[in-house]
């Protein structure tokens, strides 16, 4: 992979109630199905329309699921991870890692259509410029007093 990619990584606890058709999402990953190079983690690959996850609205395609009902998803075979979800009961607590790309370049796991992120300098340069202008205005104001 070329170029540097910056991410804003946040974690969230998502509590889902199993609906009539289940939890309503698909997963990829596992030690026997690496979806992201050098990472055997479990990722959300699809949110089903009108399913429990879609109606809740917080779980997103590309999210990494760290645990289910407190049980770590590290180093699991793909089918073992699937079975863990299927046997998780009616109320399911997911520890999820959201990853937001903030610079153009290759992306770790955002599915088939990689969204182009916001280059970090496009955020920092205006902030820095505003700070400088504010400081200059403040100094001028102080001089006038």
């Amino acid at each position: 992979m070329n170029g540097r990619v910056d991410y804003l990584v946040t974690e969230e606890e998502i509590n889902l109630t199993r609906g009539p058709s289940g939890l309503g999402f698909n997963i990829v990953g596992g030690t026997d199905q690496q979806y992201v190079s050098n990472d055997s983690g479990i990722y959300v690959s699809r949110i089903k329309e009108n399913g429990a996850a879609a109606l809740d609205g917080r779980l997103q395609e590309g999210d990494k699921i760290l645990s289910v009902n407190g049980q770590d998803l590290k180093n699991l075979l793909h089918q073992d991870a699937v079975d863990l979800f299927r046997n998780a009961g009616y109320a399911v607590s997911l520890r999820v890692q959201h990853r937001l790309q903030v610079q153009n370049g290759p992306i770790g796991h955002r599915g088939e259509g990689d969204p182009s992120g916001i280059p970090i300098f496009m955020v920092l340069v205006p902030v820095f410029a505003l700070t400088m202008v504010a400081a200059w205005a403040f100094m001028r104001y102080r001089q006038q007093l």
Epitope: G22, N26, I27, S45, K48, H78, R86, E112
Partner: nanobody, 126 residues
């Protein structure tokens, strides 16, 4: 969004064979669940066969023993080998894909399991 392109359809005599192919786009084809459905004129879309990421296969009772689904992950392609064809197999055959495994109980014959669909290829058995 996965692009699916079917090929291999056409006219065939009863008792004959055809092999359908479905080429898929995407860098993670090996994680896709792939399926074939068919739709005859004036009938509902009908499940034919499916294959999971690890090669597990599922068939409709009407094609068991005659049709074989397979996949080649290196070529991003799924195949449907159809033998002992009869006029009842005449239909437009559609390829379908879902990325990843459902965390709910899997119903291979349910079209809602699949997000992406090809345009179809016509099979006519006379």
């Amino acid at each position: 969004q996965v692009q699916l392109v079917e090929s291999g359809g056409g006219p065939v005599q009863a008792g004959g064979s055809l092999r359908l192919s479905c080429a898929a786009s995407g860098r993670t084809f090996s994680t896709y669940v792939m399926a074939w459905f068919r739709q005859a004129p004036g009938k509902e879309r009908e499940f034919v066969a499916a294959i999971s990421w690890n090669g597990s296969t599922y068939y409709a009772d009407s094609v068991k023993g005659r049709f074989t689904i397979s996949r080649d992950n290196a070529k991003n392609t799924v195949y449907l080998q159809m033998n002992s064809l009869s006029p009842e197999d005449t239909a437009v055959y559609y390829c379908a894909a879902a990325i990843g495994s459902t965390v709910d109980s899997y119903s291979p014959s349910d079209p809602l399991e699949y997000d992406d669909w090809g345009q179809g290829t016509q099979v006519t058995v006379s």
